[in-house]
Interface confidence: low
C-alpha cells in the first residue's frame, strides 16, 4: 500500500532505535571520512524530522521519497567538495542518477587506520559512560570500512556487543570474558560483510537473474521440503530486501526483511521445521537465525533427477515455452540433493545442462543427443572435488603456515603484476580456508571451501576493478560469476610477464623484525617471499624451499645474537647473495 | 571463436601406445590450465589428466598414472597425451578441455584397445 509518507511509514514500522542505527549506517557508508560527531547530529536532525512526519505526514518534504531525504542532507554539508572531492558532482543531479552517483563513490577500501580494540578497562569504561553513544561507535566504526554491510545485520552485530559488554564489565576478570566473545562476534561480522559485498557484486555486475540463481541453489539446499513454488516466492522478496540494502536504501531494506521473516515464520510448516527455534525469537535475532538457519533433513523418497530432465519426452518443450521456470525447478531439484556441493558447482552444473539443452533441443533427435548428459557433467563434480583434496593434503602436510607460503608462490605466479600486499593478504586469506575447512566431515570441506574462496576471490575483483594491472585477473572477474574459481585455478605461471629486476632493499631485513608480534613476521617474511617470486617466477619447488630455509634460519641466527642489528648488517647481504646463487 | 580439435586416435592392441594431440586456437593458450577427460562407451566422462599454463605441473587420475604422459607446446598451441602399455579399459573417446570446464570440449578422438 502507498503511504503518504514513507519515512513516517518506516519509522513506524522500525521503531525510533533500530530507526536511528539504520540511518547512522547510511550516513557512514556513503560519507566514509566524516568524523563521528558530525554523523550523530544528521542523525538527530533527520529522526527529528521523521517524528515530524509522523505527527503530520502531510508537514512540508515529509511526502519525499528517503533516498531524496537523505541526498539533500548530504548535499547540504557545507564542507563536502572539501572532504569528499568530486562526490560533490553527484548534487548537480537529479534523482535516481544522483543517487547512482553517491553509489559509485563508496569506497571497499578507504584509507582508515585498522579499527583497533581497546583494553577491557577502557572499553567498558566508555561503555559505562553512555552506551547508547558506545554503540553508535562500533556501528559507525564497521559501516565506514565496510560500506556494503547487511545494515539489519549490523545491528545485530551491535546488539550482541552490547550485551557482551554489559556481561563482561561486571566480570572480576573483564579480558578474559570479553576476548573470546569480541573475537567471535569480529570474525562472525567480516564473513557476514564479505557475503553480503558478493551478493551485491552478483546483483550489480552479473544483473537480478544471477542472484536469483544463486539463492535458488542456496534456499533449496537449505529448505529441501519446500515446493519450488515456496522457494521462488522467498527469492523474489530476497531478492527485493538485497537490492534495497545494496542500493543504500536501508531502511526499506531492513523493514522489508522484517516483513520476509514474518512470512517465513507464518509459512513455517510449507517451508522447513528447523524454523520452529527462529520463529519465537525477536526481530533482530529472527532474521538473523533465518539466515544462519541449519538445512532441513531431506525429504524420503525423491525420484531420480534423470526422470523429469533426461527420460521425460517433454523437456524440450518445456525448456522452450518457460525456460527460466524450467532451469530454476532443475536447479532447485538438483541443489536440495545435493547440500554437500557449493553454490558454485550448483550453478555451474545448472549453466552445463542449459547449454546441452540449448544444443540438443535443435538438432534432429534431442533425447540421444541429452540421454547422457548427468554423466557429461561429472567433471564439473570430479575437478572441485580432486582440488580440495589436493589443497586439504598439502595444508595438512604444512600447515597454515607453510600453506599460505605455498599460495603465494601459486598466486604471484598467476598474477604477478598484483602488488605484493594484496598478493600477501590474499595468500592469508586463502590459506585461512585451510583451516576452516579442511578438518570438517568430508560431506561439509567441498561447499565450506568453494563458498568462501568465492567470498575471497570477489573481494579481489572488487579491489582489482578499482586499480587493474592484470588482463588475465580482469578476464577470470568479469567473464562468469560461477566460473571465477575454476578460472583462476586454471591460470598458471604468467608467461607474459617480463621478472621484476633484483633489488635487495626487498630483502634487507633489520633487528626490529624479532620482536614483532608473530603474525606481522610471518607477513614481513612472506612479502619478501613474493618479491622473490616477482624477481624469479619460474624458480622450482627446490629452489624456494632452499632459499625459505636461508632465510629462515638467518632469521633465527640473528634473533638470537647478542648484538642482533650488527648480525642484520653482517649477514644480510651475504643472505642476498646466496640466494641469488641459488636462483641463478 | 574457442577451438579444440583432438586427433590421433585409432584401434590399437593392449600393451601398444599412441599419441594423441589437440589443436587449440582462440584464446590465450599460455594461459589456462589443459585437461584430458574421456568416455568409455555407455559410461560417464572419466577426469584423465591436467597440465599447468606452462607445463611445469601435471596431474594425473590414479587409473593411468605411470602409463600415460600429459606434454604441451605453446608454441604450437598444441596439447599432448601420450599413452603407453594400453590396456581394454583405456578404450574411450578422449577430448580435451580448457582447464576443469565442460563447455570448452572439443568433438574428441576414439582409441580403441582391442586384441
Known amino acids: 500500500e502507498a503511504h503518504k509518507s514513507e519515512i513516517a511509514h518506516r519509522f513506524n514500522d522500525l521503531g525510533e532505535g533500530h530507526f536511528k542505527g539504520l540511518v547512522l549506517i547510511t550516513l557512514s557508508q556513503h560519507l566514509q571520512k566524516s568524523p563521528f560527531e558530525e554523523h550523530v547530529k544528521l542523525v538527530n536532525e533527520v529522526t527529528d524530522f521523521a517524528k515530524a512526519c509522523v505527527a503530520d505526514e502531510s508537514a512540508q518534504n515529509c511526502g519525499k521519497a528517503i533516498a531524496t531525504l537523505f541526498g539533500d542532507k548530504v548535499c547540504a554539508i557545507p564542507s563536502l567538495r572539501e572532504t569528499y572531492g568530486e562526490l560533490a558532482d553527484c548534487c548537480a543531479k537529479e534523482d535516481p542518477d544522483r543517487v547512482e552517483c553517491f553509489l559509485q563513490h563508496k569506497d571497499d577500501n578507504p584509507n582508515l587506520p585498522p579499527f583497533e580494540r581497546p583494553e577491557p578497562e577502557a572499553l567498558c569504561t566508555a561503555f559505562k559512560e553512555n552506551n547508547d553513544r558506545f554503540i553508535g561507535h562500533y556501528l559507525y566504526e564497521v559501516s565506514r570500512r565496510h560500506p556494503y554491510f547487511y545494515a539489519p545485520e549490523l545491528l545485530y552485530y551491535a546488539e550482541k556487543y552490547k550485551n557482551a559488554l554489559t556481561e563482561c564489565c561486571e566480570a572480576a576478570d573483564k579480558a578474559a570474558c570479553l576476548t573470546p566473545k569480541l573475537d567471535a562476534i569480529k570474525e562472525k561480522a567480516l564473513v557476514s560483510s564479505a557475503q553480503q559485498r558478493l551478493k551485491c557484486a552478483s546483483l550489480q555486475k552479473f544483473g537480478e537473474r544471477a542472484f536469483k540463481a544463486w539463492s535458488v541453489a542456496r534456499l533449496s539446499q537449505k529448505f529441501p521440503k519446500a515446493e519450488f513454488a515456496e522457494i521462488s516466492t522467498i527469492v523474489t522478496s530476497l531478492t527485493k530486501v538485497t537490492k534495497e540494502c545494496c542500493h543504500g536504501d536501508l531502511l526499506e531494506c531492513a523493514d522489508d526483511r522484517q516483513e520476509l521473516a514474518k512470512y517465513m515464520c507464518e509459512h513455517q510448516d510449507s517451508i522447513s521445521s528447523k524454523l520452529k527455534e527462529c520463529c519465537v525469537k525477536p526481530t533482530l535475532q529472527k532474521a538473523h537465525c533465518i539466515l544462519e538457519i541449519q538445512r532441513d533433513e531431506l525429504p524420503t523418497e525423491l525420484p531420480d533427477l534423470a526422470v523429469d530432465f533426461v527420460e521425460d519426452k517433454e523437456v524440450c518443450k518445456n525448456f522452450a515455452e518457460a525456460k527460466d521456470v524450467f532451469l530454476g525447478t532443475f536447479l532447485y531439484e538438483y541443489s536440495r540433493r545435493h547440500p554437500e556441493y557449493s553454490i558454485g558447482m550448483l550453478l555451474r552444473i545448472a549453466k552445463g545442462y542449459e547449454a546441452k539443452l540449448e544444443k540438443c533441443c535443435a538438432e534432429a533427435d534431442p533425447h540421444a543427443c541429452y540421454a547422457k548428459v548427468f554423466d557429461e557433467l561429472q567433471p564439473l563434480i570430479d575437478e572441485p572435488k580432486k582440488l580440495v583434496q589436493q589443497n586439504c593434503e598439502l595444508f595438512d602436510k604444512l600447515g597454515e603456515y607453510g600453506f599460505q607460503n605455498a599460495l603465494a608462490v601459486r598466486y604471484t605466479q598467476k598474477a604477478p603484476q598484483v602488488s605484493t600486499p594484496t598478493l600477501v593478504e590474499y595468500a592469508r586469506k586463502l590459506g585461512s580456508v585451510g583451516t576452516k575447512c579442511c578438518s570438517l566431515p568430508e560431506t561439509e570441506r567441498l561447499s565450506c571451501t568453494e563458498n568462501y574462496l568465492a567470498l575471497i576471490l570477489n573481494r579481489l575483483c572488487i579491489l582489482h576493478e578499482k586499480t587493474p594491472v592484470s588482463e588475465r585477473v580482469t578476464k577470470c572477474c568479469t567473464e562468469s560469476l560461477v566460473n571465477r574459481r575454476p578460472c583462476f585455478s586454471a591460470l598458471h605461471v604468467d608467461e607474459t610477464y617480463v621478472p621484476k629486476p633484483f633489488h635487495a632493499d626487498s630483502f634487507t631485513f633489520h633487528a626490529d623484525i624479532c620482536t614483532l608480534p608473530e603474525k606481522e613476521k610471518q607477513v614481513k617474511k612472506q612479502m619478501a617471499l613474493v618479491e622473490l617470486v616477482k624477481h624469479k617466477p619460474k624458480a622450482s619447488e627446490e629452489q624456494m624451499k632452499t632459499v625459505m630455509g636461508d632465510f629462515a634460519a638467518f632469521l633465527k641466527k640473528c634473533c638470537d645474537a647478542d648484538n642482533k642489528e650488527a648480525c642484520f648488517t653482517e649477514d644480510g647481504p651475504k643472505l642476498v647473495a646466496k640466494c641469488q646463487a641459488t636462483l641463478a | 571463436d574457442v577451438q579444440l580439435v583432438e586427433s590421433g586416435g585409432g584401434v590399437v592392441q593392449p600393451g601398444n601406445s599412441l599419441r594423441l594431440s589437440c589443436a587449440a586456437s582462440?584464446?590465450?593458450?599460455?594461459?589456462?590450465?589443459m585437461s584430458w577427460v574421456r568416455q568409455a562407451p555407455g559410461k560417464g566422462l572419466e577426469w584423465v589428466s591436467s597440465i599447468s599454463g606452462s607445463g611445469s605441473d601435471t596431474l594425473y587420475a590414479d587409473s593411468v598414472k605411470g602409463r600415460f604422459t600429459i606434454s604441451r607446446d605453446n608454441a604450437k598451441t598444441t596439447l599432448y597425451l601420450q599413452m603407453n602399455s594400453l590396456r581394454p579399459e583405456d578404450t574411450a573417446t578422449y577430448y580435451c578441455?580448457?582447464?576443469?570446464?565442460?563447455?570448452?570440449s572439443g568433438q574428441g578422438t576414439l582409441v580403441t584397445v582391442s586384441s
Open positions: 578441455t580448457i582447464g576443469g570446464s565442460l563447455s570448452r
Open positions: 582462440g584464446f590465450t593458450f599460455t594461459s589456462f590450465g
